[in-house]
Each structure stands twice: as C-alpha cells, then as structure tokens.
C-alpha cells in the first residue's frame, strides 16, 4: 500500500494509472467504500462523499491513462485509504493529513515560549524536527516547546514531520517582538547632550501601546521613573516627564530621547519598558550612560568617570602626543604638579578609546581653560 | 583552535632594527589588545607595550619609547612589533599576548628568538 | 611603575605536596573602583611560551587543575599548589596589570624534591 503525506490547507494528488493508454473507467473511493468520484466516458462523475466540493480529477491526463484523485483544501479528517478502481485492478494509497500550528499569536515577546502542536490522524505515530532560523533543531512528537525565545528566532521556522519514512515540511513565520538590541552604553563629556535610542527589531502595520523608562543614577539609592509615553501607529506622545532631568522625546518610532546635558548625577543604568496592546509582557531594553569629567584644582589634574564602566576599562591621564602618565583600571586618575599643555583623559577597552575629554593646563600663573 | 603564529628566528648586528611578526588564526584580532613581552636567556618577562589591532592605538613601556613601533595589517589579521637601534642586550626571545576578555594574557605566541651579535 | 616581587626564588617540593608561591606589589594593584584584584599567575615550562594559569587573583583560567588556586588581596598573594605532580615542574611568574606599564614578578623556580 502506498503511502502519501498531505499538509492541511494544502492540495494533495493521488496518483492511479491504468495499463492501457487511454480514457477508460475508473473510480476512486475511500476505505467505507463510498464512491468519491470517476468518469462516465469524458464527463467526471461525483459521488456522496464528504469530499465533494474538493475532490477534482485531470481530464487532460485520462487519455494517457492516468486517473488522479486531487483533493483540495486538506483536513485531517481527510486522512483515510483511498482506493482507485481501473481495469478490474485496484490500487490503495493511504493518505496521512498533518496540521502545525503555533499555540498562540505567531508574534510573540522576546523570552515567551513557542509551542508548536502538530495535529495528526488516529493511528499514526510521527516524529517532528524543527530549525529555528538561526539552526537550531528541536525534536518531539506531537508538541514541541521553545522556552525563552530571543531575536534570532525570528524568521521562518522548518518543520520536518516523519511518518513511515515518508515526509511532509512545514514553514511556520515567526516574529519575535524585541528591540535590536537588549542593552546599550553611551559614553558622554560631561556638559554634552545625550542621545537615547531604542530601535525595535520588527515592524508591524500598526503599533500602539505605552512606555517609560525608569533610571537608577550610581550617586542615588533609589531608581526613579524619567519619563512615561504612550504609542498609537507608530506616534508617540509624552505623557509625563521629570522636572530633573528634563527628556525630551521624538514623536516618530524608532523611540528617541535627548538627555539636554550629560551631567555626573545622571550616570547610571536605566530600564526602558515597552507594554504592547493585546500582548501579555513587556518589552525591555537596558540603556547605561557613562559621563566623564577632567579638571584642574590648584596642582591636581583630576579624571573621573561616573556609571556602569566595566573592570577591563582603563582610565589615563596624558600629555598630548606623550606616553600616558597615570594608567589605571579606576574610576578616578589624576596627576599633581601637571606640566602645562594639552592633556587628555581616556577611557578606553583593549586601547579601543570609548571616551575622552580634553583640559589645557596653563602654566601656574594662569587658570585652566577646558575646551 | 585559536592560536597566535610568529616569524621566525633572526640574527642581527647592532644598530640594526628587527621586525617580528605576529599572525592571529582562529580569531579575529581585531577584538583584543596585542601586547608584545621579551624574555632575555634565563631572565624573566617585560613586558614592551601593546597595540590595539582595530583602532591602531599604541601604549609603550617607558624603556623602548622611541625604539619601539608597533603596527597592523588587519586584512592578514598581523601585528608587527619592531625595535631599532638593536644592542646585545635585546638578546631575547620575543613574545606576542593577547589580552583576553578578563586582561590577563590568556594566549601566546610560540615566541621569535632574536640574537644581536656583531 | 609597580615592582612585583617573589618569593622564593626557587622551591623544591615533594610529589604530592603543597607548593607555595607568594608576590608582593610595590603599591595596591586591588581596584577601589571595582573591587577587582587586577594580579595573573602563569607557568612557563623550558621552551614554552607562559601559559596562564590564574586572573584576578582568584580565578582559574579553564582547563586549569584545581590543584592550582590563588589568593591574595592589596599588595600580598599567593600560588598554591595542592599536590605538587611531576608536570608542575616549571617556572611561576606573578604580573600585575592594573596599571600600565604591565609588570611581572622575576619568577619562582619549582623543582622536585
């Protein structure tokens, strides 16, 4: 008996061919013998089954002898044994229908979960391999669970369904709704502005929903909320902001804050939450703000960084053009008696420089000029 | 398997410069600092300077400053350490280190034997 | 520039013994910024390039035996070797790098008694 695999929705052709090379009678019916349809000479014929409106047949091949049962629009209530009836023969073809779904919403937040449920006829035992856009392969049987999904599940899910050593694939579109990055540092001068954005990695039609960010500066014991917007197609408007500092906020998507002056204060980390309509979760991207400051007080010329600063990041004092005279991995280098010119503080990881800010020390008769 | 490759051996006369070379396989060098370490015949190890690979930024030891130079080719994923004005004292083998993800020096070249003889 | 020093210079130790090396800095090489002690060990065996063996004092670099293990804090650390194994015949090098320039102890002999 040969064995053929359909995938629901689809459109399946079981094959029947007669020995003779020409139009001759046949019909197909299913294993309760109920005729399905045939011909009677050149017309197609149907008969009682429940697959009437999607049984079809190609009259263009029945002058070659062959007889197709095509079955549109598949359920897996169509899986049965269907035989073909041709020159006293009869031919047996067994059809497995198989359905993959996703459990919910095919749009899910970064770090759900993604269950794919296959649907299979009574009496079969399938086995499912999936891969995920970014290769990974996930076995089961009839469920399959992807716990903590991240940015790089994104995309078109291949899904292999094996059963009698026949199989069916299955593509399944997935959006993992995230921003394009979990977490971002910005480096600042103190006195510069500070430019915040938070670009999401998906776009859909319409995108409406609420926001805010909450900041823990290094300097303050407690986090406390910057600003709250809301979303509705793609707009963003404001709805609260502090007086200290005062954000302002684009009103077009990618999500965009200023930050007038970067400021010792303000360093720290902060916490932007995404809340989207009809979406249980949030959306979350981490946002840190490094501020560094070089000055000059009486004989002692001081660097200093505020924030989240790794412990591989180096802090050095140097004349320009010069080796660096104080290296160290603080948060605080500074040097006594500075001869004058143009010294720079650099904040640097591996010798890749993140941040530096330039002071000129005059000589000691005259005051610091910072440009 | 992530390895750093150098030149080979070199002898030289002084006031001659050497040029060592320091070919990174496994890895893109760009990620880390490269700092360059000797090690005289049965002496211990000093350390020369670094380089970094992607921004081209250098820091030298007080010592080699001005004998010193230190470059890049990063389409061959190299770094080049080279000290002039060679005396017998530069007698050492010569060691390229990556600096790892946590600072210390997590992997080495096999080390270019360089003799300064006349 | 920060001066590390070690002791002994040399060490003979008995298979399956404890060995035990110390460094001592010219100045703190613990960030105050951090709370990080910015100290590496590394053994070097007759031909071969260092091989790290210990990073912020304390922490083993993979693949390292936890018969090797570091502590120390400030100014003052210590290598110690468990049970000394024929192989961890070498020599043992202390370098601190929290600030440049970069510098290692003179290094400690470790033979077998």
């Known amino acids: 008996k040969k064995v053929v695999l359909g995938k629901k929705g689809d459109t399946v052709e079981l094959t029947c061919t007669a020995s003779q090379k020409k139009s001759i009678q046949f019909h197909w019916k299913n294993s309760n013998q109920i005729k399905i349809l045939g011909n009677q000479g050149s017309f197609l014929t149907k008969g009682p089954s429940k697959l009437n409106d999607r049984a079809d047949s190609r009259r263009s091949l029945w002058d070659q002898g062959n007889f197709p049962l095509i079955i549109k629009n598949l359920k897996i209530e169509d899986s049965d044994t269907y035989i073909c009836e041709v020159e006293d023969q009869k031919e047996e073809v067994q059809l497995l229908v198989f359905g993959l779904t996703a459990n919910s919403d095919t749009h899910l937040l970064q770090g759900q979960s993604l269950t794919l449920t296959l649907e299979s006829p009574p009496g079969s035992s399938p086995s499912v391999q999936c891969r995920s856009p970014r290769g990974k392969n996930i076995q089961g049987g009839k469920t399959l669970s992807v716990s903590q999904l991240e940015l790089q599940d994104s995309g078109t899910w291949t899904c292999t369904v094996l059963q009698n050593q026949k199989k069916v694939e299955f593509k399944i579109d997935i959006v993992v709704l995230a921003f394009q990055k979990a977490s971002s540092i910005v480096y600042k001068k103190e006195g510069e502005q500070v430019e915040f954005s938070f670009p999401l990695a998906f776009t859909v039609e319409k995108l409406t929903g609420s926001g805010e960010l909450w900041w823990q500066a290094e300097r303050a014991s407690s986090s406390k909320s910057w600003i709250t917007f809301d979303l509705k197609n793609k707009e963003v408007s404001v709805k609260r902001v502090t007086q200290d500092p005062k954000l302002q906020m684009g009103k077009k998507l990618p999500l965009h804050l200023t930050l007038p002056q970067a400021l010792p204060q303000y360093a720290g980390s902060g916490n932007l939450t995404l809340a989207l309509e009809a979406k249980t979760g949030k959306l979350h991207q981490e946002v840190n703000l490094v501020v560094m400051r070089a000055t000059q007080l009486q004989k002692n010329l001081t660097c200093e960084v505020w924030g989240p600063t790794s412990p591989k990041l180096m802090l050095s004092l140097k004349l320009e053009n010069k080796e660096a005279k104080v290296s160290k991995r603080e948060k605080a280098v500074w040097v006594l008696n500075p001869e004058a010119g143009m010294w720079q503080c650099l904040l640097s990881d591996s010798g890749q420089v993140l941040l530096e800010s330039n002071i000129k020390v005059l000589p000691t008769w005259s005051t610091p000029v910072q440009p | 398997q992530v390895q750093l490759v150098q030149s080979g051996a070199e002898v030289k006369k002084p006031g001659a410069s050497v040029k060592v070379s320091c070919k990174a396989s496994g890895v893109t060098i760009s990620n880390y600092a490269i700092s360059w370490v000797r090690q005289a015949p049965g002496q211990g190890l000093e350390w020369m300077g670094w380089m970094n690979p992607n921004s081209g930024n250098t820091g030298y030891a007080q010592k080699f400053q001005g004998r010193v130079t230190m470059t890049r080719d990063t389409s061959t994923s190299t770094v080049y350490m080279e000290l002039s004005s060679l005396r017998s004292e530069d007698t050492a083998v010569y060691y390229c280190?990556?600096?790892?993800?946590?600072?210390?020096?997590?992997?080495w070249g096999q080390g270019t034997m360089v003799t300064v003889s006349s | 520039d920060i001066v590390m020093t070690q002791s002994p210079d040399s060490l003979a130790v008995s298979l399956g013994e404890r060995a035990t090396i110390n460094c001592k800095s010219s100045q703190s090489v613990s960030s105050s910024s951090y709370n990080k002690n910015y100290l590496a060990w590394y053994q070097q065996k007759p031909g071969q390039p260092p091989k790290l063996l210990i990073y912020?004092?304390?922490v083993r670099e993979s693949g390292v035996p936890d018969r090797f293990s570091g502590s120390g804090s400030g100014t003052d650390f210590t290598l110690t070797i468990s049970s000394l194994q024929a192989e961890d015949v070498a020599v043992y090098y202390c370098?601190?790098?929290?600030?440049?320039?970069?510098?290692f102890g003179q290094g400690t002999r470790l033979e077998i008694k």
């Open positions: 370098q601190q790098y929290y600030s440049t320039p970069i510098t």
């Open positions: 280190a990556r600096e790892g993800l946590l600072d210390a020096f997590d992997i």
């Open positions: 912020w004092a304390s």
